[in-house]
């Protein structure tokens, strides 16, 4: 009983004056609270609370469920308590089967006893199964049995409170422990796409997936450098115990250019935070940008192959692509493919394969591409390098020797005189006249060069060589001279092609 100090308010006194009282089932409970400022009696057991404004608490026929703590409170807020056990051999436990434990914390199995004098008050596994080896508990007859430091592995553990009564083990109703996980890692966050490219007015929708051990993980979409609350929609899943997933979908129904920017999906729990970003670019209209992968001026040798390659960015997706030469569209010999299989890819490659090009196939090759918004084109100027070909080699009526050669690049014509029967013509002869015949035309075909020398300069038998050459190769034509007296006999031209 409390000691009384004069002048200070004192707690109420209770009769009978003991901390615990044991009564048998069916007996009377009579508790008297003595205090000039009596306010109420309160009864508590498990989650149940009852009040009584009478200073004497009387229960005529006690039941096991009357087991609990009886507290008398006065007007000063001071109180005193007595715990009553109502011994009922048929009901040794009062139970609240709801059993939740937070990982790494203690949790109470609420099975208070109605008889404090039973022995071996403990926990047992259901159906004779042993409890986990590391499970520690502390029994308290008035409250239940406290499981210390709950482990995640105890989730869904089935157990009973147990006592020994007259040498026999008595079990309570079963309890199923539900463990609430502690956060021991940051949430896992991912985003449906890392970047989005849209035209004005199109819908922007992006989904963030947040994974954690429980639904109490926090998540939100944020716009970088902005405090505006974004509109999100959610879905959630429990993929079994300790495996929770939330999807947060952010939508802008009609995106504008100024919506462009970086959006962050942020998630945190008591352990830490994680985030992932996605970039939105909104353009007022679509575009196509073409990048040649080779020089747009191409030189290729006669009979060789060349690939004309472009990369291009197209948004929205390209709808029509074509390669054109001399107003004709290629139906084959070309391929067009996306640069990557990535869903957000906007870069494409187009290749035109030109094989065994002839000298007549030089010219402008044009790649055209279009989408729903724009058209674009790029031109390649292809020059076919050809070895000179001597078209004519004649003695003109005015006594001139004339050589006409065609090739690309423009051939150079040199003249040589070989006296007598020598095979090597080393003495060079300067031409009288050199003309490029078709330089005014398109610069893709062969260039024709005409060169003339005066045959009157030759006084001896011999051979005159006309040699046409360029970067690709050389070709020669020969004029034979024979003198009879002072007269030149016929000139016999013949050619010798030198590779």
């Amino acid at each position: 009983q409390p000691s009384v100090s004069p002048g200070e308010p004192s707690p109420p006194s209770i009769h009978p004056g003991k901390s615990d009282l044991i009564v048998r089932v069916g007996d009377e409970i009579r508790l008297l609270c003595t205090d000039p400022g009596f306010v109420k009696w309160t009864f508590e057991i498990l989650d149940e609370t009852n009040e009584n404004k009478q200073n004497e608490w009387i229960t005529e026929k006690a039941e096991a469920t009357n087991t609990g703590k009886y507290t008398c409170t006065n007007k000063h807020g001071l109180s005193n308590s007595i715990y009553v056990f109502v011994r009922d051999p048929a009901k040794l436990f009062l139970v609240d089967r709801s059993l939740y434990g937070k990982e790494d914390n203690d949790t109470l199995v609420r099975c208070p006893l109605t008889d404090p004098e039973v022995t071996n008050y403990s926990l047992k596994g259901c159906q004779g199964k042993p409890l986990p080896k590391d499970l520690r508990f502390i029994p308290d007859p008035k409250a239940g049995i406290m499981i210390k430091s709950v482990k995640r592995a105890y989730h869904r553990l089935c157990l009973h409170c147990s006592v020994d009564q007259e040498g026999k083990s008595v079990l309570s109703e079963k309890f199923i422990l539900k463990v609430r996980p502690a956060f021991k890692a940051v949430p896992v966050v991912s985003v449906s796409k890392a970047s989005y490219l849209l035209r004005e007015g199109e819908e922007f929708t992006v989904t963030c997936t947040i994974k954690d051990v429980s639904s109490s993980v926090y998540s939100t979409w944020k716009r970088e450098n902005s405090q505006t609350k974004l509109q999100e929609k959610y879905n959630s899943w429990h993929h079994g115990d300790f495996n929770y997933e939330r999807q947060a979908t952010l939508t802008i129904s009609s995106a504008r250019v100024n919506d462009s920017g970086v959006f962050m999906c942020y998630a945190n729990n008591t352990f830490g935070s994680a985030n992932v970003t996605t970039t939105l670019e909104v353009v007022d209209k679509g575009f196509i940008n073409i990048f040649p992968m080779i020089n747009t001026t191409v030189f290729v040798n006669d009979g060789e192959n060349v690939d004309l390659i472009v990369e291009y960015e197209a948004f929205p997706k390209p709808e029509h692509q074509q390669w054109i030469y001399m107003n004709r569209t290629f139906t084959d010999k070309w391929e067009d493919y996306p640069k990557s299989e990535n869903e957000s890819n906007i870069r494409y490659v187009s290749e035109l394969h030109l094989t065994r090009l002839k000298g007549t196939e030089g010219g402008t090759y044009t790649f055209l591409v279009s989408n729903s918004d724009v058209n674009a084109a790029i031109a390649f100027n292809v020059y076919v390098n050809t070895k000179p070909e001597i078209l004519t080699y004649d003695r003109l009526v005015n006594g001139m020797l004339q050589c006409v050669a065609a090739g690309f690049p423009e051939p150079t014509i040199d003249w040589y005189f070989c006296p007598g029967t020598e095979q090597r013509c080393s003495a060079s002869v300067l031409p009288v006249d050199v003309q490029t015949l078709n330089s005014s035309g398109p610069p893709f075909g062969k260039l024709v060069v005409q060169s003339s020398i005066d045959s009157s300069a030759f006084k001896h038998n011999g051979t005159v060589e006309c040699k046409a050459y360029n970067d690709v190769g050389k070709t020669s034509a020969y004029f034979n001279f024979a003198f009879k007296g002072n007269n030149k006999e016929q000139i016999h031209p013949h050619t010798l092609f030198t590779p």
């Epitope: 609430r180 639904s215 929609k233 879905n235 959630s236 899943w237 429990h238 993929h239 079994g240």
Partner: antibody
């Protein structure tokens, strides 16, 4: 004692709007997720929407997505359901219910309020 | 969305009978299953949560079992006040869905 009291039901024309309220007492609204569940005349229960304890997360049935908005005013301990673009098939008794937490089911329900959508 | 199928849709039984109602989910919902009782003109009441846990204040004649896709509500000895409609509901993933209900009538 936990109590939930719905109000705001009534007759509304198709395409119209209505706001249902659910006044909660006996517990703190912020500690619990709250849901709306409806029951068409003579039919079974249909989950409509749930809002988390913080109010940060809202979930909707496909049939009401984009038309209904769940919200809460924790200072007034009140849950709301704003219903727009109402259709005849939205006619039902609407119940608000408390989620007992940790996905343990809806442990307390209001008495329901009838919404009739008809021209 | 997860579909919940209850069977039977109705049954007739007598006081004292053992009654079993089943609920099947269209995909794995682990133990995220709740059972409710509803009487005409009244709001539903939670009986069982987490497939097998008895809600406080619910008589112990009600029990639940199952996990994954197949679940059972059992009333061990039917009492007069148990004649009602029973619904299962999954809380594994949104949208949360109810079964079609089972009406328990007096034989």
């Amino acid at each position: 004692e936990v109590q939930l009291l719905e109000s705001g039901g009534g007759l509304v024309q198709p395409g119209g709007s209505l706001r249902l309220s659910c006044a909660a007492s006996g517990f703190t609204l912020t500690s619990y997720a709250m849901s709306w569940v409806r029951q068409a005349p003579g039919k079974g229960l249909e989950w409509v929407s749930t809002i988390s304890g913080s109010g940060g997360y809202t979930y909707y049935a496909d049939s009401v997505k984009g038309r209904f908005t769940i919200s809460r005013d924790n200072s007034k301990n009140t849950l709301y359901l704003q219903m727009n673009s109402l259709r005849a098939e939205d006619t039902a008794v609407y119940y608000c219910a408390r989620d007992s937490g940790y996905d343990r089911g809806l442990d307390y329900w209001g008495q329901g309020t009838l919404v009739t959508v008809s021209s | 969305d997860i579909q919940m199928t209850q069977s039977p849709s109705s049954l007739s039984a007598s006081v004292g009978d053992r009654v079993t109602i089943t609920c099947r989910a269209s995909q794995n919902i682990y133990t995220y299953l709740n059972w409710y009782q509803q009487k005409p003109g009244k709001a539903p009441k939670l009986l069982i949560y987490d497939a097998s846990s008895l809600h406080s204040g619910v008589p112990s004649r009600f029990s639940g079992s199952g996990s994954g896709t197949d679940f059972t509500l059992t009333i061990s000895s039917l009492q007069p006040e148990d004649f009602a409609t029973y619904y299962c509901q999954q809380s594994s993933s949104t949208p949360y869905t109810f079964g079609g209900g089972t009406k328990v009538e007096i034989k």
